[in-house]
Every structure is written in structure tokens, then in C-alpha cells.
């Protein structure tokens, strides 16, 4: 059914709209779903309706439950439903999942943080901002009407972000609180079809019988945070893993970010004591992102000793 | 009584124009959104184009995106939808229908619908 | 774009009889849907609205149930008037959409 979640803290107020919208011009009915009683429209009443909203001033966990409103036009009449979950106040600093707001993103251009569900409530500036429970203090921190702006935004400012403020309703004041995470994101972040830059597609990798030999697979998937981005080495078309070889493993190695913001990955291929029969299988570096697979294959050539031969004139 | 009578539809060539207009009586024309909905002869019904009672927000199927106008004149409560560069595939009725919740960004049913005006694209 | 797939595609009944008609939504619609019925030569008709309420005028015999993605519409006891082809239509976003039809004909 057209249902929409709204929560809250005890002894804070809450303000829920109909999830049906209408025009201001139609009437609108609560009532309480399981005893299909009557919502009143009193004021004093401390949960009473006000056309497409619906007060709890303040909330008690007791309220929690399912409103029905039905939106009365002349011809129509829809209905919705608002399931109010009321919280216990949390004596410790962390906000439960089940209290946050929608994550924003923000970037070193756009560091707007908007307080969820401001604009149901009569407030007047300013808000109040949290971090992690910590008032925001300095001049990086500006609040700004319904939202925070931070200045030269930085990877450490992703976080939960709580403003607080006050709702006034015919003269009597109440506490209102809001949780959203922030994260940061690299603006100038893109991503590419695998690049390659190790080993070189047919590479002939000479290596010494009885000897340790390191193959490392280096590709870039583009600027910044990458998502799905891998690389990894097969053995015969078949991963290292599965191939069950012992001497034969592979080890991450650095991810690399390049001063030119290149966001690349290492897969070292470590053989110990090569032998003979290693020199039979293919190797494959694979690099798989998005945007799809690129790979480079290698094969192992046994490395000739270095020949003493004289020099005759 | 609330009616929508469709006109304007006809014989026209591929890659031709055409205009049908649609005259709504019988309710407060601007405060409604409206809607442009098609049926090719024998074939079911296709949503066209919306536009909000103001005129401000209009929206359209991908298929006519850059070729159909929708358009009103709330003054005459006249609705309208300009079709160029018109496709074989565009023949049907084409009738103009009331959205009688209107609210912003959202739609709704279609509770009254004009009888339809016929418009075929051939050579 | 949501996509509505009704079925059957054609319902052969007698007056009298109960009819069930099938709209199932490619993806979940809330109960974002109305059926509409249509005559030959003439427009169609809003019957249901919000999957289950009858829109003024519209006999208690027709009613809709369902939610999400799986719809149907009922005419309990058909009368000679209800053989035509019903259509739903979903609103719940940007475009609007109907499904193909059902037409209901005399067996």
C-alpha cells in the first residue's frame, strides 16, 4: 500500500505528512489505522492533525504504529499511510542505523548538507550542527539556512552530521534532531577501461630453473575512488586458486595512486623453485573493471646461462 | 458537465504537421493537468504528453520527444499538441483526457476523455 | 519504463458470469493503478482507481484488488454493457503506461 516511514526520538516533536499528496484545497483525515479512530484537529491535543500533517507534540514511543490519512477531493478520495516508529533516546554518542537520513555525497565544490525534513517544521535560523556528537566549531563550518556548507572539504569530514533545532507551534518550543552520514567523493574522479601496464601482451618472461620468479600484473582504472576495479593473474585460463599449485601464489600488491591522480592496482605472481613444466602453461594478467576485462598473457623461457666463450682473433 | 472535444486531426503526408487542439468546458480548465493519450487503429492505448495547469512542466513519451509540442492557452481553455516530422507510426485517435488530482511532479488517472480525433500519416 | 502485461489477452464468458482480469507490473507500482474500460468507437472509461476504489458512478459489481506488482479486476456478474476491453494503467512514474488490453467478449 502507498506507505511511507517516518521516525523519531521521544520527547521530541515529529511532523509526518500524508504520503498522498493533494492540493491545499482538499480536506484531510487521520486516523489511527488499527482502531480506525478519528485523529483530532484540537491543537491542545498533543497528537492532533493539521490538514496534510500530522503533529506529535511531543513523541512518545507509545505513538508508534501506522496513521491512515485519506485526501478528500470533490470527485476522488486516496489513501495513504504513514508508519511512525518512536525511538528511546540512545544514552551513548552513536546513532543506530535505524535514526539516519538518507547519506549525501558531497565533493570539494559541493559540501551542502541538508537538514532531512526541516521544511514540516516552524523553525528559525540558526541550526545547530554535529559531528560524530561534537558541536562543529571554525570557520569552515558555515550554517546556511536549512543546510551546512564546509569549506575545502576533505576525505576526514565524511561522517554522521545531526543538526538539531527548534519547532514552534502556537508559542510552546520543541527539540527536533536529524542524522545523515556525509561522504566525500573525488569530483574530478572518472573511470576507464582497464589500462594495462604490466606485463606487455605476449611478453616473454625468461626465468631460471630452480630459481624463485615474480610476475607482477599493474593496471589503472582511472582517477580517484574506483568501484569493482581487480586484477589477478590465471594460470591456464584457470584461477590461481583452483589451479592447486602450492608453489604458485599471488599477493596483492601497493594500490597506487600517481601524482597524476592514476588509480592503479598490483598483483604479484610469486613461483618458487620454477621447474620445467612451468614453462608450459600460459600466464594471464587480468584487469576487470565497470567498463569491462582486459588481458595481457606471458609465457616463461628458460634463461640460458651466460656462455665464457674465448675470443679468438 | 465537463467536456473535451478534440479537433484538427486528418490525411497527412510523412514528415508533414499537423495541430490538434482540444476544448475543455465544464470545469476550471487551469487548474488541471492535461494529457495527450493515443490508439493506433486496432492497437491499445499509448500515453503522449502532460502538461501541468499552469503550462509550466510538460513531459512527453520517448517516442514524440523533439517532434510533438504540447501546449495551452488557459485564457481560451484550449489544449493543444503540435506533431511534426510525423512517422506512418503515428496514425491513430489521438484524444486529449483530464488529470483531476494534479499534483506537482506526480500523475494520476485520466477521469475524463474527449471522443477522440483521428489522425492518419500517409503518402 | 514500467511495463503492464495483462492476461488473458481475450475472456469468452456468458452474462451472468464472474470475470478476472490479470495485470501484472514489471516492477512494483505501490497501488499506483487504475483500470479503465473501453467500448468500440468510443474513449475509454476510468473504472478503478488506487488499484481498489471505484470511481463515482461506477457499479458495485466491478472491483480491484492487489498490490505491488500482481492486480486484478472483478466483475462479479457480468451484464450485456461490460463486454468490452479493460485496460490498466499505472501512475506511479514518469511515462505513464498501459497494459495491452483484455477484451472480454460474449461466449
Known amino acids: 500500500k502507498f506507505s511511507k516511514q517516518s521516525w523519531g526520538l521521544e520527547n521530541e516533536a515529529l511532523i509526518v505528512r500524508c504520503p498522498r499528496q493533494g492540493k491545499p484545497s482538499y480536506t484531510v483525515d487521520w486516523y489511527y489505522s488499527q482502531t480506525n479512530k478519528s485523529i483530532p484537529t484540537q491543537e491542545r491535543n498533543r497528537v492532533f492533525a493539521s490538514g496534510q500533517l500530522l503533529k506529535f507534540l511531543p513523541a512518545a514511543v507509545a505513538d508508534s504504529g501506522i496513521y491512515t490519512c485519506i485526501v478528500r477531493s470533490p470527485t476522488f478520495n486516496r489513501t495513504g499511510y504513514a508508519n511512525v516508529t518512536i525511538y528511546k533516546k540512545q544514552s551513548d554518542c552513536n546513532v543506530p542505523d535505524y535514526l539516519m537520513y538518507s547519506t549525501v555525497s558531497g565533493s570539494e565544490k559541493n559540501s551542502k548538507i541538508y537538514c532531512p525534513t526541516i521544511d514540516l517544521y516552524n523553525w528559525t535560523a540558526p541550526l545547530e550542527w554535529f559531528k560524530n556528537c561534537q558541536a562543529l566549531q571554525g570557520s569552515r563550518y558555515r550554517a546556511h539556512k536549512s543546510f551546512l556548507v564546509i569549506d575545502n572539504v576533505m576525505t576526514e569530514d565524511a561522517g554522521d552530521y545531526t543538526c538539531k533545532f527548534i519547532h514552534n507551534e502556537n508559542g510552546a518550543n520543541y527539540s527536533v534532531t536529524a542524522t545523515r552520514s556525509f561522504t566525500v567523493k573525488d569530483e574530478q574522479g572518472f573511470s576507464l577501461f582497464p589500462v594495462i601496464g604490466a606485463p606487455a601482451q605476449n611478453e616473454i618472461k625468461e626465468v631460471e630453473i630452480g630459481k624463485n620468479a615474480n610476475l607482477t600484473c599493474s593496471a589503472c582504472f582511472g582517477k580517484g575512488t574506483q568501484f569493482l576495479a581487480a586484477v589477478l593473474w590465471q594460470l591456464n585460463g584457470t584461477k590461481i586458486t583452483d589451479f592447486g599449485e602450492p608453489r604458485i601464489q599471488q599477493e596483492e600488491g601497493q594500490n597506487q595512486s600517481f601524482s597524476n591522480g592514476l588509480a592503479c592496482l598490483d598483483m604479484v605472481l610469486r613461483i618458487a623453485d620454477v621447474k620445467e613444466e612451468d614453462l608450459l602453461l600460459q600466464y594471464d594478467c587480468l584487469a576487470l573493471n565497470l567498463h569491462g576485462l582486459r588481458r595481457h598473457t606471458v609465457r616463461l623461457s628458460r634463461k640460458n646461462p651466460i656462455d665464457h666463450h674465448s675470443i679468438y682473433c | 458537465e465537463v467536456q473535451l472535444l478534440e479537433s484538427g486531426g486528418g490525411l497527412v503526408q510523412p514528415g508533414g504537421s499537423l495541430r490538434l487542439s482540444c476544448a475543455a468546458s465544464?470545469?476550471?480548465?487551469?487548474?488541471?493537468?492535461m494529457f495527450w493519450v493515443r490508439q493506433a487503429p486496432g492497437k491499445g492505448l499509448e500515453w503522449v504528453s502532460a502538461?501541468?495547469?499552469?503550462?509550466?512542466?510538460?513531459y512527453y513519451a520517448d517516442s514524440v520527444k523533439g517532434r510533438f509540442t504540447i501546449s495551452r492557452d488557459n485564457s481560451k481553455n484550449t489544449l493543444y499538441l503540435q506533431m511534426n516530422s510525423l512517422r506512418a507510426e503515428d496514425t491513430a485517435v489521438y484524444y486529449c483526457?483530464?488529470?483531476?488530482?494534479?499534483?506537482?511532479?506526480?500523475?494520476?488517472?485520466?477521469?475524463?476523455w474527449g471522443q477522440g480525433t483521428l489522425v492518419t500519416v500517409s503518402s | 519504463e514500467i511495463v503492464l502485461t495483462q492476461s488473458p489477452a481475450t475472456l469468452s464468458l456468458s452474462p451472468g458470469e464472474r470475470a478476472t482480469l490479470s495485470c501484472r507490473a514489471s516492477q512494483s507500482v505501490d497501488d499506483d493503478l487504475a483500470w479503465y474500460q473501453q467500448k468500440p468507437g468510443q474513449a475509454p472509461r476510468l473504472l478503478i482507481y488506487d488499484a481498489s476504489n471505484r470511481a463515482t458512478g461506477i457499479p458495485a459489481r466491478f472491483s480491484g484488488s492487489g498490490s505491488g506488482t500482481d492486480f486484478t479486476l472483478t466483475i462479479s456478474s457480468l451484464e450485456p454493457e461490460d463486454f468490452a476491453v479493460y485496460y490498466c494503467?499505472?501512475?506511479?512514474?514518469?511515462?505513464?503506461?498501459f497494459g495491452q488490453g483484455t477484451k472480454v467478449e460474449i461466449k
Open positions: 483526457a483530464r488529470d483531476p488530482w494534479s499534483t506537482e511532479g506526480s500523475f494520476f488517472v485520466l477521469d475524463y
Open positions: 494503467q499505472q501512475y506511479i512514474g514518469a511515462p505513464i503506461t
Open positions: 465544464g470545469f476550471t480548465f487551469s487548474s488541471y493537468d
Open positions: 502538461i501541468a495547469g499552469e503550462g509550466g512542466r510538460t
